[in-house]
Every structure is written in C-alpha cells, then in structure tokens.
C-alpha cells in the first residue's frame, strides 16, 4: 500500500470505493451500487447504504407505547431509488412494476400498487422509537448511567446533535431510545435521525458500517450492554395510508 491508498478511505462508510482523484488529489469516495459521491465526514444516507448493500455480493417510569400510526419495517431489504441528494424517492417500485410510497427512512407507508400509484411528497419520519431488550445481567443498569451512555453514543459515534435524542426509557430488560427531529429543527449539516438509527441498528446487529473501527462495544459503568432484540418504530409527520384490510389483519 502507498500513502495515498492508505489515507484514501471513508471512515464513516466502508461500502465505498475511494481514490485520490478529486480536485487537487483529494480523496473522493463513491457509494457502491449508486456510484454517488459521499461526504465521509458524516453519516451516509440510509438510501445509499441500502443500495450499496443490495449491490454487494449475497452472503416507575413507564415505557412508551408506539402510536397506532407507528410503522415497523416488515418489508425488509429492497433496492431503493435515491434522489441526487441520496434521499429516498417518495415512490419505490420493484422489477415487476409493483410500487409503493415510502417515508424519509425508506419504510413503506401505503399499500402496494402499480405504476399508476402517485406519491406526491416524501413524508418525513420525525419520531423514531428504538425498542431494545438487553440480555440478562446480575442487576438492572442504573438508569441515569444508561441514559448518559446512550446519549454519548449517539453524539460521538453517530454525530447526532444531543437535542434530537428526546428520551431514554428503561424498564429492565427493555430500553427505549426516542429520537425526534422535525423538518423545521433539522439544520444544514445535521445528521438525520433516520440515518443515525440505521447505523445504530447495524451496529447492534454486529454489522458496523464504519471503516476499520471495531464493532460496537456498549458498556455502562464497565458492564457490557448486550442487546438480544431490536424493534424500531417510525412515526411520520403525516400518518400512513393503509387500507382497512391491512389495519385489521
């Protein structure tokens, strides 16, 4: 390896191809799958990450009750269409011309239709509830220590502004992290809560997206926090539109 190659990597996204051929020999990294240039000083958008993933080879406090409009990503992986900024396009279609509308985190928010389906705008997911169950420990974690550690994680590892971590709830063995970010609150350069949640989800699953960094080693006062189940609920600024058939199923 040479200095140029060694120094030309994307710390925040290992699913990239980088070469020092930008202006003045700047290191330029492009996302796999889309070939779009990415900013390696911050998180890559979930849409580009999903696209890259699909292109890769196959191998006394009460907990929050998710609202009736909360979405869970039951559809799993798909090869998304991203706009020039790397955001999800409001309408997604598969190879068989089945289409549906998605929110800003790429989760389906309508029934599936055909090519005539219209998705007028990309609806923003403004509230994300990350529901975790940790493995049994000798005793419960101290709530304020747990709160501080998770806030630190989102601030330092995912570069999410602290004001967007609305709350951390804990009732052993369930931990809930609430992320809130309205369109009006998100300034230029702010990490999106959807992207931070996706990086966290991949970290928890032991599939870190960071280049060369070790996996996530979560500890609260030195005690390992090992997650055995994760559920993520997404709340949109406009409630989703599903038929009654789905809602009663």
């Amino acid at each position: 390896h040479t200095a140029a190659q060694d120094n030309c990597t994307c710390p925040t996204n290992k699913m990239t191809v980088c070469s020092p051929d930008g202006p003045g020999g700047r290191c330029q990294c492009r996302a796999l799958g889309s070939g779009m240039a990415v900013d390696c000083s911050t998180l890559t958008s979930k849409c580009l990450l999903l696209k890259a993933r699909m292109s890769a080879p196959k191998n006394a406090r009460t907990l929050v009750r998710p609202s009736e409009h909360a979405l869970v990503d039951n559809d799993g992986l798909y090869d998304p269409d991203c706009d020039p900024e790397g955001r999800f396009k409001a309408r997604q279609c598969n190879q068989t011309s089945v289409c549906w509308c998605v929110n800003s985190v790429g989760v389906r928010r309508t029934d599936k239709g055909d090519l005539s389906l219209r998705c007028d705008e990309l609806v923003r997911t403004h509230h994300i509830l990350i529901d975790l169950r940790h493995r049994p420990t000798a005793g419960a974690f101290n709530h304020s220590d747990l709160d501080a550690e998770l806030r630190r994680l989102f601030r330092e590892r995912y570069r999410l502004h602290p004001k967007f971590v609305a709350a951390v709830h804990y009732e052993q063995p369930t931990i809930q992290i609430e992320l809130r970010q309205n369109t009006s609150q998100k300034a230029a350069g702010d990490v999106d809560i959807g992207d931070a949640a996706y990086y966290f989800e991949r970290d928890i699953k032991g599939e870190s997206l960071f280049q060369g960094r070790g996996g996530l080693d979560l500890r609260v006062r030195g005690e390992p926090l090992q997650v055995e189940r994760t559920l993520i609920y997404y709340l949109d600024e406009i409630p989703p539109k599903f038929s009654m058939k789905r809602l009663t199923a």
Epitope: T2, A3, A4, Q5, N7, S19, P20, D21, G22, P23, G24, G25, R26, C27
Partner: antibody, heavy 116, light 107 residues
Framework: QVQLVQSGAEVKKPGSSVKVSCKAS????????INWVRQAPGQGLEWMGQ????????HYNQKFQGRATLTADKSTNTAYMELSSLRSEDTAVYYC?????????WGQGTLVTVSS | DIQMTQSPSSLSASVGDRVTITCKAS??????LSWYQQKPGKAPKSLIY???RLVDGVPSRFSGSGSGTDFTLTISSLQPEDFATYYC?????????FGGGTKVEIK
C-alpha cells in the same frame, strides 16, 4: 524521495504544438494525480488540468479544453501535456505537480517560448 | 468558477516582522485551501494544505487559518529566506484556481 523531472525548454512557432513530459520517480505513479500549471513571464499561476494515471480520469480548465491533452504512460511513469494551436500568449513556464489532498511536489518547470 | 482574491498584492516587511496574507474565496471551499511559496526562477513549494496543516519540513513560523471563504497565511517572524511570492489555491472543486499572489519584499 519523490521526484518529477520535466523535459527541456522549447521554442515553437505560432500554430504549432508542444508536448512537455514529466517523469515521476520515488512513488507509485498510478496512485497520485498529476496536475499541470503554467506561469507566463511575470504573472501568477494558472491551473491547466489534472490526470489520474490510476484510471486515466482527467479534468481540464475550460480555457484549455480542446487545445490541451493530458496523457500518462504507466510503463515509463511519465505524464505528458500537449498544447496545440500555440500563440504568443502561451509563452510560459509549464509545471507538472503531483498532488495529494492539496499537498504538491513540483517538477522544475519547462519554458515554452512561442515566437515567429 | 471559484474566484480567489488574495491581498495584499505586495508588501514590504523587515526581518522579524509578523506577516499576514489573506485569501478570500467567492464561495465556501470547505477548507480545501493550500498555500505555496515561490522564489524567482524556481518552482513553487508547498507550505500549508487543508487550510491549516503544515507540510512536513516547513518551519513552524508558517501557519494557516480560516474557514468557509476567508483564509490567512501567517509568518510569525519573517526570516531572510522568506522573501518570495506566496499563492493560495482552492481545490474544493474543478477548475482549481489560484490567488493572484502576494510578493513579500524587504523593507
């Protein structure tokens, strides 16, 4: 150590072409971009274009598009800049420079004089 | 194209003086700015890259600062060998553009 050795001075007639070479040593040629910069007598520096020998990707200053051609010969670790349809205002010292993140190693320069 | 406006175009200073040269970009350049020193009849030499990073082997009296559109090269205590012309370069986007240069002369 990194070295860029350029070809010697040239005197050319208006309308003709010149090809300046830049032989690189001390590093892996295909790993860094080569930029070409010129400097007219008593004037400042002017960027002409950039080539990445690793993929032959190049970018030109619009001002020289169509007149300048950048090439790289990986077998000899040599970059070339050819400028055609020369005019008197092309009289300048032409530099090649290896860049990485804005940090540059420069060749010694090649004086091209265009005169009838 | 991004315009780089360098000032002053020339200055006279004495050995030991603190010298400041500024470069203003016509738009934000994300700190992708470098500084070069050139002596008569010689090729330019890199001093600073990424706005504030000192090139190995360059004396610590040279420093770079600034962000966004406004950048500064400072020579904390001018030495006899520092009399030369200094150029800034933006490499945020193509085409790369240089400032017009600042000639530092002996007072």
């Amino acid at each position: 150590q990194v070295q860029l050795v350029q070809s010697g001075a040239e005197v050319k007639k208006p309308g003709s072409s010149v090809k300046v070479s830049c032989k690189a040593s001390g590093y892996r040629f295909t790993d860094y971009v080569i930029n070409w910069v010129r400097q007219a007598p008593g004037q400042g520096l002017e960027w002409m274009g950039q080539i990445y020998p690793g993929s032959d990707a190049f970018h030109y200053n619009q001002k020289f598009q169509g007149r300048a051609t950048l090439t790289a010969d990986k077998s000899t670790n040599t970059a070339y800049m050819e400028l055609s349809s020369l005019r008197s205002e092309d009289t300048a010292v032409y530099y090649c420079a290896r860049f990485f993140e804005g940090l540059a190693y420069w060749g010694q320069g090649t004086l091209v004089t265009v005169s009838s | 194209d991004i315009q780089m406006t360098q000032s002053p175009s020339s200055l006279s200073a004495s050995v030991g003086d603190r010298v400041t040269i500024t470069c203003k970009a016509s738009q934000g350049i994300n700190n992708y700015l470098s500084w070069y020193q050139q002596k008569p009849g010689k090729a330019p030499k890199s001093l600073i890259y990424r706005a504030n990073r000192l090139v190995d082997g360059v004396p610590s009296r040279f420093s770079g600062s600034g962000s966004g559109t406004d950048f500064t090269l400072t020579i904390s205590s001018l030495q006899p060998e520092d009399f030369a012309t200094y150029y800034c370069l933006q490499y945020d986007e193509f085409p790369l553009t240089f400032g017009g240069g600042t000639k530092v002369e002996i007072k």
